[in-house]
């Protein structure tokens, strides 16, 4: 017992933790100043009616990971102000309602990874009136799922079902919830999902399916016996996919009318772009989704991939497209003239290269982009990049960050409606006209920066974090500015003059420079007290680095004698 | 500058494994992919496979896919070739390079001459 | 596998001189409006050197007498002025399909 009371440490709001430690058993003398109480990773087996009684203010209990077999009746009796319970990847095999009935205020309960069958012979959850996330169910043992399983629940903000090895789907299982704001579920198979998804259509507003083999998908038509369709976002995480099946999931997507966002996550697509409806399958209508986002997407045979034509009619409503580390070099020009609404273009963590961007911008190229993102591609010279965008007449923001161009010509051809440009971490050493003058905000952060002479009329924020400047911008070249954020360079110091200067600044982050703690420096940064309404990040990041005798200390406290300033 | 050195010369016998290394620098490491390629004496290139640091994910010459294992360390900004069983064919200078835009390979190692003689 | 023939073998020239050197492939190698067809210069003792990506866009850092054309199965490299410094093996690549293939080469040598 002293052993395991040892392994446990409150602070005086109440807040107790003691996981990942070799505790056996619930620590005896708990009392109610407990709030929060944290025994994940540890070695409990067993709860009893005792353990827990006395705390009766307890709003939050984590045993996750622990070897817990078995709970009595009564255990969590007194636990009426419990608001977070989870109970995860621990070993009961069987749920018992009598645990939850006494927690009225519960809005959280974790039990994935339990080894039980099903949710229990009767409805676990129907006391809990207040439940706003709840997560259900194993990778092997949860099997069946039971019309009284969610009997009692009515709204509900996330329902996570690992249904992996579901073998048995009661029909209207999951319709007694009357809404879902984004229920995930983890099936392998696919055999249970249309079963499944005529119940959740008209309740479930957020819908994600995770790691489900869809290679063999097929729809069959559903007779959902109502159109009106509550799904507005449709992810699917670590899902396999072929040609043919993707055509058939584009089916099933097309019985949802409202879907808004599509979303593909780690996925495999198993196929080499054959997306050629077969005679009898009618033309698939996108709908209204709008957003499509594609992270991280895995094509084995991706150099075999030869025809997406098929496609390009369903992307012309589309406004927003993320397609993230997915190993794209080139997106084809004819898709590019398709994309005729995209205002928002992601194509992060990709290989594109100046050249084969051009053939992606072509002329007609995505004519209301406004946003592009080629943050860490293969971009390599800054005169090529803004030459191949300046047929994107729309576009406004450009983010091109982590692409390692080095040098900055003297000039540069950009998109006439620039105002936002994100060249951090690119290993530029000098900035010049190559800048466009309409910018009113630039990001060059995280670079060799030594020097900032650039007149910006329009320019708005700044942002030059991480380089090796030694002074403050010259205010009269950036008239426009409101944000300055100039933390970790080499500023010594600043004046009140200097920063008077910058009329319309409203925000400064400076700090995290090394700043000589003159008696000037000190009088100023002191006294003002309108300062910390301007330095954002004042007083913790600025600190003296000399004298050396106050290296490491805060500015705002640092005292100077009389002596050092007053030296004639 | 961006730059790629490979390890030393390799003598082998057949049957035996090598594993040869390529240390990059100049450039982020997990941005690019790596590629291996071959050049047997006086002959033509020949296309092993290539690593994405990123993700680990690889690809093969179907010649090699029972043979090479291509691996990278990104900590130490390093990718590796592993032949096995090799015969006296192998015998070949051994290139990486790195792989841009995703279909070209813009900087070179200096090769690694592995002989596989009994 | 795309199998890609050079020709000529050997090509002899005096300082000055146009070079043309021909690339054809068994099977297109466009990629939606790309040639993914690059060349590279071999000098004896030292690795590839990229000199063309895409059939026809110049990797910088290589004289502006280099140049790439053509498109499907057919490419060319053409050096404008051959100069002492160009002799060597030829490679042409692509990277349409996997694996990727080199065609058996071209040597330039100065008269």
């Known amino acids: 017992e002293s052993s395991n009371q040892a392994s446990l440490s409150c602070d005086r709001n109440g807040i107790c933790k003691g996981s990942s430690g070799s505790l056996n058993s619930i620590p005896s003398g708990l009392t109610e100043a407990v709030k929060s109480l944290d025994l994940s990773n540890n070695r409990i087996t067993y709860i009893s009616n005792s353990d827990l009684q006395r705390c009766v203010n307890l709003q939050a209990l984590v045993l996750t990971s622990n070897g817990i077999n078995t709970i009595e009746e009564d255990s969590f009796s007194s636990l009426g102000s419990l608001e977070h319970l989870d109970l995860s990847y621990n070993y009961l095999s069987n749920l018992s309602s009598s645990w939850f009935k006494p927690l009225s205020s519960l809005t959280f309960l974790n039990l994935l990874g339990n080894p039980y069958k099903t949710l229990g012979e009767t409805s676990l959850f129907s006391h809990l009136t207040k439940l706003q996330i709840l997560r259900v169910g194993n990778m092997d043992t949860f099997t069946k799922i039971q019309r009284k399983d969610f009997a009692g629940l009515t709204f509900l903000e996330e329902l996570e079902i690992d249904a992996s090895d579901l073998q048995s789907y009661e029909p209207k299982s999951l319709k007694s919830i009357q809404n879902v704001s984004h229920l995930i579920l983890h099936m392998k198979q696919h055999i249970l999902l249309l079963e499944i998804f005529v119940d959740v259509t008209s309740s479930v507003e957020c819908l994600e399916l995770r790691d489900t083999d869809l290679d063999t998908f097929h729809f069959s038509e559903l007779s959902t016996g109502e159109t009106n369709s509550l799904i507005k976002k449709f992810t699917f995480r670590n899902v396999k996919i072929t040609d043919e099946s993707l055509f058939q999931v584009m089916k099933l997507l097309n019985q949802i009318s409202g879907l808004l966002e599509l979303e593909f996550d780690d996925c495999t697509l198993n196929g080499v772009g054959n997306f050629r409806a077969s005679d009898n399958d009618r033309v698939i209508d996108p709908g209204k989704v709008e957003t499509l986002t594609i992270r991280r997407l895995h094509i084995p045979r991706f150099y075999l991939f030869y025809d997406l034509s098929t496609l390009y009619s369903l992307t012309e409503r589309v406004k927003r497209i993320t397609v993230e580390n997915s190993k794209v070099f080139l997106v084809p020009c004819l898709l590019s003239q398709h994309l005729k609404s995209l205002e928002y273009l992601d194509l992060s963590e990709n290989l594109m290269v100046e050249e084969y961007l051009k053939n992606s911008a072509c002329e007609d190229a995505w004519p209301s982009l406004q946003t592009l993102i080629l943050r860490q591609n293969h971009l390599a010279s800054l005169e090529k990049t803004g030459e191949t965008l300046l047929t994107l007449k729309n576009l406004t923001n450009i983010d091109i960050s982590k692409n390692s161009f080095h040098s900055m010509p003297e000039t540069c051809q950009w998109p006439e409606k620039m105002k936002y440009l994100n060249l951090s971490s690119t290993r530029i050493h000098s900035v010049t006209g190559c800048i466009p003058k309409t910018l009113e905000i630039l990001d060059v952060s995280n670079n060799n920066l030594n020097l900032f002479s650039l007149n910006l009329p329009q320019l708005k924020e700044l942002y030059i974090s991480r380089n090796k400047l030694m002074t403050l911008p010259d205010a009269s070249l950036l008239p426009m500015l409101l944000v300055l954020k100039i933390s970790r360079n080499a500023i010594t110091t600043f004046s009140k003059e200097q920063l008077d200067s910058f009329h319309t600044l409203k925000t400064l982050e400076a700090g995290g420079n090394n700043f000589i703690c003159s008696c000037e420096f000190l009088s100023f940064t002191q006294e003002q007290q309108a300062l910390a309404k301007v330095l954002i990040d004042w007083p913790a990041n600025y600190l003296c680095d000399s004298p050396s005798h106050v290296r490491g200390q805060q500015v705002q406290d640092v005292r100077l004698s009389v002596s050092e300033c007053h030296r004639t | 500058q961006v730059q790629l050195v490979q390890s030393g010369s390799e003598l082998k016998k057949p049957g035996a494994s090598v594993k040869l290394s390529c240390k990059a620098s100049?450039?982020?490491?997990?941005?690019?992919?790596i590629n291996w390629v071959r050049q047997a004496p006086g002959q033509g290139l020949e296309w092993i496979g290539w690593i994405y640091p990123r993700d680990g994910s690889t690809n093969f010459n179907e010649n090699f896919k029972d043979r090479a294992t291509i691996t990278v360390d990104t900590s130490a900004s390093t990718a590796y070739m592993e032949l096995s069983s090799l015969r006296s064919e192998d015998t070949a200078v051994y290139f990486c390079?790195?792989?841009?835009?995703?279909?070209?390979?813009?900087?070179w190692g200096q090769g690694t001459t592995v002989t596989v003689s009994s | 596998d795309i199998v890609l023939t050079q020709s000529p073998a050997t090509l002899s020239l005096s300082p000055g001189e146009r070079a043309t050197l021909s690339c054809r492939a068994s099977e297109s190698v466009e990629y939606y409006g790309t040639s993914l067809m690059q060349w590279y210069q071999q000098k004896p003792g030292q690795p590839p050197k990229l000199l063309i990506f895409g059939a026809s866009n110049v990797e910088s850092g290589v004289p502006d007498r280099f140049s790439g054309s053509g498109s499907g199965t057919d490419f060319t490299l053409k050096i404008s002025r051959v100069e002492a410094e160009d002799v060597g093996m030829y490679f042409c690549?692509?990277?349409?399909?996997?694996?990727?293939?080199f065609g058996g080469g071209t040597k330039v040598e100065i008269k």
């Open positions: 690549q692509q990277s349409r399909k996997l694996p990727w293939t």
């Open positions: 100049g450039f982020t490491f997990t941005t690019y992919g």
């Open positions: 390079a790195r792989l841009t835009g995703g279909t070209f390979l813009d900087y």
